[in-house]
């Protein structure tokens, strides 16, 4: 027989399996080119003086052999007499020390037995029900695979695992996930359902961080609001270094833990962008708005546990900075402009209600008017601040409204909405005798008094119905009582009260008639 052919004769040794524990095993055969094939196997035991023979039986029942000598790998062509298009049964017989040792048989169609590629390119790693899920695109035109993985941690050797059969354009594997240590994974594939097919090489390492990314130690402090309407957020952190398995040291793609600072500006919900994520370590400047700040540690699986802080709004108010004029067409606010081409966010919310009920309006970028003021107007029909109640107003400004960290606070103040003149009219005005020539007038607090800084004063008016003389008495906004003296017994008087703001004169209450009875001596 020619060495390049499978010899259809009896092999040159007796046919008897010694049944020993040593011998050939793990036979793998595959196609290596259009017309060539290769079989390889392992040999367990002393190798001195061992001769290997690759045996092949065709579906017709005819059998042949290739003599491999001491080699454990053998190549042959499609012209070697082995039927490659049809199923054949192959095994190895090793002749040593006057005995024959046989490997387990493999039955396969050599023509289709190609060595698969390992997972190539991007292996996506995610977490699924406490396990690790790896997913990759099946290498083109190699659908139908068995997949294995091996994994190790910085302190443990490789452990082998099975991903099970795969039969789709994407393949996946569920693997164990470690809570607190990084792991290195590698994957390999072989043809599904083909006995004796060869495993691919191992894939490049897939480095996987622990399920729980280490938490940073963070402390925040917020400075006072400066003249520019901004305050600095400062923080400190000590990131933890992760110990990595051997194949992940150096670059270690996949095991990185990143710490990010997520700012959520709670105020001014009508602006374009409410959240901004920054690298931890940058020191952002904030407006006087309320913020939620989170430090998010994340790894390949996405965010881990985060630490969240609430930064309350700076509630320092400047009641004089805002000028409000109410006209027949609507209401206009004026305030000192910040700079050229500024966008302003005017936010208002009824006092005493949840912050979630804040309403706001964003102005188009505007330049200061000749008086250096910025303005915002609204009509009565718009319904803005139309209810007769106290509103807390904050105005924010930004030259770049799309950038969350560039907003500043212009002012915060209170405003009474709707028809403040009428709504502020004091009710329940009552008059009580105080002495022979004086009375005590008191009233229920004006609704304007619920609005800090809005009520400038009360004015009490007393009119002598006989002489038509009128006297007016200013009363502090914190008081709801005044004593009128110098009155004459038997004269009819009417008393009225009104509540004034810095910009508006109030509406008089209903006239209250009274007189001091003439005292008759016995």
């Amino acid at each position: 027989c020619r060495t390049s052919e499978c010899c259809f004769q009896d092999p040159p040794y007796p046919d008897a399996d010694s049944g020993s524990a040593s011998g050939p095993r793990d036979l793998r055969c595959y196609r290596i080119s259009s017309d060539r094939y290769e079989c390889s196997w392992q040999y367990e035991g002393p190798t001195a003086g061992v001769s290997h023979f690759l045996r092949c039986c065709l579906s017709s029942g005819r059998c042949c052999y290739f003599a491999a000598g001491s080699a454990t790998r053998l190549q042959f062509s499609d012209q070697a007499g082995v039927s490659v298009l049809y199923t054949v049964t192959l095994w190895v017989e090793s002749w040593a020390r006057n005995q024959t040792e046989k490997s387990p048989e493999v039955t396969l169609q050599l023509y289709n037995s190609v060595k698969y590629e390992p997972p190539l390119g991007d292996i996506k790693v995610s977490k699924l029900a406490g396990q690790l899920r790896m997913e990759w695109e099946t290498p083109d035109n190699q659908v139908g695979a068995e997949v294995q993985f091996r994994h190790r941690t910085p302190s443990s050797p490789w452990k082998l695992g099975d991903c099970g059969p795969q039969d789709d354009d994407t393949e996946s594997c569920l693997c164990p996930l470690e809570m607190n240590v990084a792991q290195e994974f590698q994957l390999r594939r072989r043809q599904l359902g083909s006995q004796g097919s060869s495993w691919s090489k191992w894939s490049s390492p897939v480095c996987v961080p622990p399920e729980n990314p280490p938490q940073p130690q963070v402390r925040f402090s917020v400075e006072q609001l400066g003249q520019d309407g901004r305050r600095r957020l400062t923080l400190k952190e000590q990131p933890t270094q992760l110990e990595l398995p051997e194949g992940c040291q150096g670059l270690a793609p996949g095991t990185e833990v990143t710490y990010r600072l997520q700012l959520h500006m709670l105020s001014c919900p009508c602006k374009a962008k409410a959240t901004r994520t920054l690298h931890l370590g940058k020191m952002p400047y904030l407006s006087g708005a309320a913020y939620n700040v989170a430090v998010i540690s994340s790894n390949q699986f996405g965010p881990g546990l985060n630490q969240t802080w609430h930064i309350p709004a700076d509630t320092h108010t400047e009641p004089v900075a805002l000028n409000i004029s109410v006209g027949t067409n609507g209401t206009t606010m004026y305030w000192p402009a910040r700079a050229q081409s500024m966008t302003y966010c005017i936010e208002w919310q009824p006092v005493g209600q949840d912050g979630g009920l804040a309403t706001c309006s964003l102005t188009a970028p505007q330049d200061p008017d000749p008086a250096g003021m910025a303005t915002y107007s609204w009509s009565r029909e718009s319904g803005a601040m139309g209810q007769e109640k106290c509103y807390y107003i904050t105005i924010f400004a930004s030259a770049h409204p799309e950038k969350l960290t560039l907003w500043s606070t212009v002012l915060s103040t209170y405003h009474f909405g709707g028809n403040a003149s009428a709504a502020g009219t004091p009710h329940h005005v009552s008059v009580k005798n105080h002495s022979l020539d004086s009375v005590s007038v008191d009233w229920a607090p004006s609704l304007l008094s619920t609005c800090p800084g809005v009520l400038k004063e009360y004015v009490v008016r007393c009119r002598d119905e006989d002489s038509k003389q009128v006297s007016e008495h200013p009363v502090q906004p914190t008081e709801t009582q005044v004593t009128l003296s110098g009155l004459r017994a038997g004269v009819a008087y009417t008393v009225q009260v009104r509540a004034d703001t810095a910009w508006l004169r109030g509406v008089w209450s209903q006239p209250q008639r009274f007189s001091i009875e003439v005292q008759v001596s016995d």
Partner: nanobody, 127 residues
Framework: EVQLVESGGGLVQTGGSLRLSCAAS????????MGWFRQTPGKERESVGE??????????ADSVKGRFTISRANAKNTITMYLQMNSLKSEDTAVYYC??????????????????WGQGTQVTVSS
């Protein structure tokens, strides 16, 4: 699903050359191999050859060995297989069909191993 469309057929003189193309679209990553078959009136469809796509390994029927060459080109979501036919003979006159299989146990000489087929293109070799 996989769609196959052949092109390039026509009339050619004996000894001449022709190149057929077969464009596969659809779920092409799942295709294991693509082959060429031919059929003349009143006869069974016979294998011309096949290419295993992931490796480029080819098989040829004895009647075309040395004259015909199968190759393939991969693009995004499409695979094009070519059949370069040289030294054409009158017995090569037939309708040529492109086929694709998704299983790893297929025998390239058997038509029933292929799940997908093209509509065919006529090749006529005249003397």
């Amino acid at each position: 699903e996989v769609q196959l469309v052949e092109s390039g057929g026509g009339l050619v003189q004996t000894g001449g050359s022709l190149r057929l193309s077969c464009a596969a679209s659809g779920r092409t990553p799942s295709i294991v191999a693509m082959g060429w078959f031919r059929q003349t009136p009143g006869k069974e469809r016979e294998s011309v050859g096949e290419i295993i796509l992931s490796k480029g390994f080819t098989y040829y029927a004895d009647s075309v060995k040395g004259r015909f060459t199968i190759s393939r080109a991969n693009a995004k979501n499409t695979i094009t297989m070519y059949l370069q036919m040289n030294s054409l003979k009158s017995e090569d006159t037939a309708v040529y069909y492109c086929a694709a299989r998704q299983n790893w146990s297929g025998n390239p000489t058997r038509t029933n191993e292929y799940e997908y087929w093209g509509q065919g293109t006529q090749v006529t070799v005249s003397s």
